[in-house]
């Protein structure tokens, strides 16, 4: 029997469904267990105009150590503000710097990506190491890339249509899923049905879909049924803020007691059949009907409460209009460049327009120093000797002042350049964790403590330790201590910084062979990164220290020898 229920799009204020999925339009996952470099490639397609993207890289420690180095190749078709999170991961990022703008300094090694089409980009990436994963994503809002998770059956990665990236990649599309609703004819009462249909994915392994349901009603006002239909290998974990009738395929459990699995039902796998099911359960309204690709997390927000259903005949706007200029975000887009004894501020007009800001002026603290309009950007430049620059031993400071139409008072932001000629970086070796007495001698089997300092200190910049290694000459080889701001091996520990913010770490050295080297060179690459502002101001230096090695010890921990 045909169920009369004319599904129509529901306005976002009545119901919205967002989801996270590992299904991609094209993709592949491969195994490259012996590769030194883990290579991942993302092709990201955005609609015209700048977009915001949150990209998180997550690594699970394997055998107590961080994973091998990672190359992430980011190919985008239009401007993107990127918020990158890759804490402690030895990451190399290849991207097109004219299209990708970081919301904060990425603190990773970067490489300019050649302007190649997909085939050549894949080859360019593969030249650096076997590709572990590659994916094409359409208008992502956020991406989670899990490293060291590749479960591919093949040793090579070849883009194929409609792939499931498994645990390697999960992403959230910017556009919410299409939510439709309808009135079930001939059913009295106020019971509402929320129907979620998860379509089969490319891989048929067991899956748990977390369904978060948020209905904005007083608990007593609601008479509802949640119908969840999916392929047989899908079970459900339900996290709802209301009591409701549950009708699912497979098995389901509740977030509050996840270990208690409840057997579901055999449900029809067509929209008509599911509408019939809702009717059979005495629902008078289908408040939301959603079909999704195989997802890992689905969030349903609805505000129907069994009331009158409002459908929107016109195409619905999937993102709320953003007509107000955000001064904070605007100020974060000012790029500071320091070169040739001059400070240059750059503000790209395309980004300004995207924030719906109208700029009436950009100056330094001295209002007579105004920005030049260079077509696609505003450029404000001044020598360190003018425009009210404040010159200290370590830094040149000023203020960027932006007048915007929507604000009566100007926006201000401190801008800085480092006075590199006056800065000196020192490595200090200590024999105790109190960092009191410096030494130039290490003893195998005894912990050594290292601190890096910059003087004079620079409060607006963060001193970070990017990498360190100990060169023990031809007999001893090289011992990697820190890589990608993460400790390498069990015998290296990153310690809390000094009260002044100086990075510290400790290491323990052992030798298994003789002769033991008598000297070594500790070499560290440090970075000064602005606490706020752009990565253009990052400064890198390599600092060396000659060490003496005393007293043999043939037991123990990590070394090369």
């Amino acid at each position: 029997e045909t169920v009369h229920c004319d599904l129509q799009p529901v306005g976002p204020e009545r119901g919205e469904v967002t989801y996270t999925t590992s299904q991609v339009s094209k993709g592949c996952v491969a195994q490259a267990p012996n590769a030194i470099l883990e290579v991942h490639v993302l092709f990201l397609e955005f609609p015209t105009g700048p977009s915001q993207l949150e990209l998180t890289l997550q690594a699970s420690k394997q055998n107590g150590t961080w994973p091998r180095e990672v190359l992430l190749v980011l190919s985008v078709n239009s401007s993107v503000f990127l918020h990158l999170q890759a804490l402690g991961i030895p990451l190399h990022l290849a991207y097109n710097s004219s299209l990708v703008t970081f919301q904060e300094p990425p603190g990773v090694n970067t490489t300019e990506l050649p302007s190649f089409p997909k085939t050549q980009i894949l080859e360019w990436a593969a030249e650096r190491g076997p590709i572990t994963s590659a994916a094409e994503l359409n208008d992502p809002q956020s991406i989670l890339l899990r490293l060291g998770q590749a479960q591919g059956s093949l040793s090579f990665c070849m883009l194929e249509a409609s792939q499931d990236m498994g645990r390697t990649l999960e992403w959230r599309p910017r556009t919410p899923a299409l939510v439709r609703g309808c009135h079930l004819e001939g059913v009295a009462g106020h019971k509402e049905a929320h129907i979620l249909r998860v379509l089969p994915g490319h891989s048929a392994g067991p899956r748990t879909v977390t369904v978060k349901v948020e209905l904005s009603c007083a608990p007593g006002d609601l008479d509802a049924v949640l119908i969840l239909q999916g392929p047989p290998y899908v079970s459900w974990l339900i996290d709802a803020n209301h009591n409701m009738q549950i009708w699912t395929t497979g098995e389901y459990s509740f977030k509050i007691f996840p270990e208690k699995n409840i057997r579901g039902f055999k449900l029809p796998d067509t929209p008509q059949g599911l509408l019939g099911e809702a009717r059979m359960l005495n629902a008078s309204i289908v408040a939301s009907f959603v079909e999704l690709p195989l997802a890992s997390i689905v969030s349903l927000h609805a505000s129907s409460c069994g009331g009158r259903l409002q459908t929107s005949p016109a195409p619905i706007q999937t993102t709320p209009p953003k007509d107000t200029c955000s001064p904070e975000l605007l100020m974060s887009l000012i790029q500071t460049k320091c070169a040739d004894d001059a400070m240059t501020l750059v503000l790209k007009k395309e980004l300004v327009a995207h924030l719906k800001c109208t700029i009436t002026g950009l100056t330094f603290w001295d209002p007579s120093c105004e920005a030049e309009d260079r077509g696609d950007k505003f450029v404000l430049r001044s020598a360190y000797s003018s425009c009210g620059m404040q010159v200290s031993a370590s830094m040149i400071s000023n203020e960027a002042v932006v007048n915007i139409l929507s604000s009566s008072s100007p926006q201000r932001k401190k801008v800085h350049c480092l006075n590199m000629d006056s800065l000196s970086f020192q490595l200090g070796l200590y024999l105790s964790p109190h960092f009191l007495q410096a030494s130039n001698t290490i003893e195998p089997g005894q912990q050594s403590f290292v601190q890096v300092r910059v003087s004079p200190s620079v409060s607006e910049f963060l001193l970070q330790l990017d990498s360190c290694h100990l060169d023990l000459g031809p007999e001893g080889g090289t011992v990697e201590l820190i890589q990608g701001r993460a400790a390498k091996g069990n015998c290296v520990s990153l310690l809390s910084p000094s009260p002044e913010g100086d990075p510290r770490f400790s290491f323990l050295l052992h030798f298994y062979t003789v002769p033991i080297p008598k000297t070594g060179t500790l070499s560290c690459t440090v970075a000064l990164r602005p606490k706020t502002g752009s990565q253009d101001q990052e400064v890198h230096r390599t600092v060396f220290m000659r060490l003496n090695i005393i007293s043999p010890d043939l037991s123990g921990c990590t070394s090369k020898g």
Epitope: S115, T119, A126, E127, P130
Partner: antibody, heavy 118, light 112 residues
Framework: QVQLVQSGAEVKKPGASVKVSCKAS????????MHWVRQAPGQGLEWIGN????????FYDEKFKGRATLTVDTSISTAYMELSRLRSDDTAVYYC???????????WGQGTTVTVSS | DIQLTQSPSFLSASVGDRVTITCKSS????????????LAWYQQKPGKAPKLLIY???TRESGVPSRFSGSGSGTEFTLTISSLQPEDFATYYC????????FGQGTKLEIK
């Protein structure tokens, strides 16, 4: 000068495997992609796959995935193409060709005739 | 996959003639970021390996005579031989390298 020299003709039975070699000289072997292309009698050119000797990375055409295996031995600057589970329609001339990023397939081997017949 | 269709499949001409071979692509092979067409032309003589003539749709490979020229953009391309020489009688293939690698079915140029 750049040269790609392939192994000699092969006659195989259906179901068997064949391994064709391609020795490169006159350039840095590890810096260029090596591609394999075949041509059945009286037919056009068909791309099989490619390998980057510097990293060992490979790509294959969907049609040959799982049946063709590309490998290299960088110590002797030689690329190999192995095709398994041979069928009579695999009878063709197999070419190795170097791809220059800018210009394309700029140097080709002389070709290896593989005949599959029971 | 991008399919390439060449026409004609066979072509008879005489020495000194001007000859045009067309290649149509099922999708554009123009890469917008660098405005280059990822299409090449090869010449193959019986019993020999193919030889690169043209790349980026219109750039002649070094050592290729100036009578060979390539033109077109997007999905329609032509190879023109302005004045046929005896050594030009061969089979010609177009080849796209924008999305993986595919070849046209070939155009056999014979002496009339």
């Amino acid at each position: 000068q750049v040269q790609l020299v392939q192994s000699g003709a092969e006659v195989k039975k259906p179901g068997a495997s064949v391994k064709v070699s391609c020795k490169a000289s006159g350039y840095t072997f590890t810096s260029y992609w090596m591609h394999w292309v075949r041509q059945a009698p009286g037919q056009g050119l068909e791309w099989i796959g490619n390998i980057y000797p510097g990293s060992g990375s490979t790509f294959y055409d969907e049609k040959f995935k799982g049946r063709a295996t590309l490998t290299v031995d960088t110590s002797i600057s030689t690329a190999y193409m192995e095709l398994s589970r041979l069928r009579s329609d695999d009878t063709a001339v197999y070419y190795c060709t170097r791809r220059n990023y800018v210009t394309g397939f700029d140097y080709w081997g002389q070709g290896t005739t593989v005949t599959v017949s029971s | 996959d991008i399919q390439l269709t060449q026409s004609p499949s066979f072509l008879s001409a005489s020495v000194g003639d001007r000859v045009t071979i067309t290649c149509k692509s099922s999708q554009s092979v123009l890469y917008s970021s660098n405005q280059k067409n990822y299409l090449a032309w090869y010449q193959q003589k019986p019993g020999k390996a193919p030889k690169l003539l043209i790349y980026w749709a219109s750039t002649r490979e070094s050592g290729v005579p100036s009578r060979f020229s390539g033109s077109g953009s997007g999905t329609e391309f032509t190879l023109t031989i302005s004045s046929l020489q005896p050594e030009d009688f061969a089979t010609y293939y177009c080849h796209q390298y924008l999305s993986s690698y595919t070849f046209g079915q070939g155009t056999k140029l014979e002496i009339k």
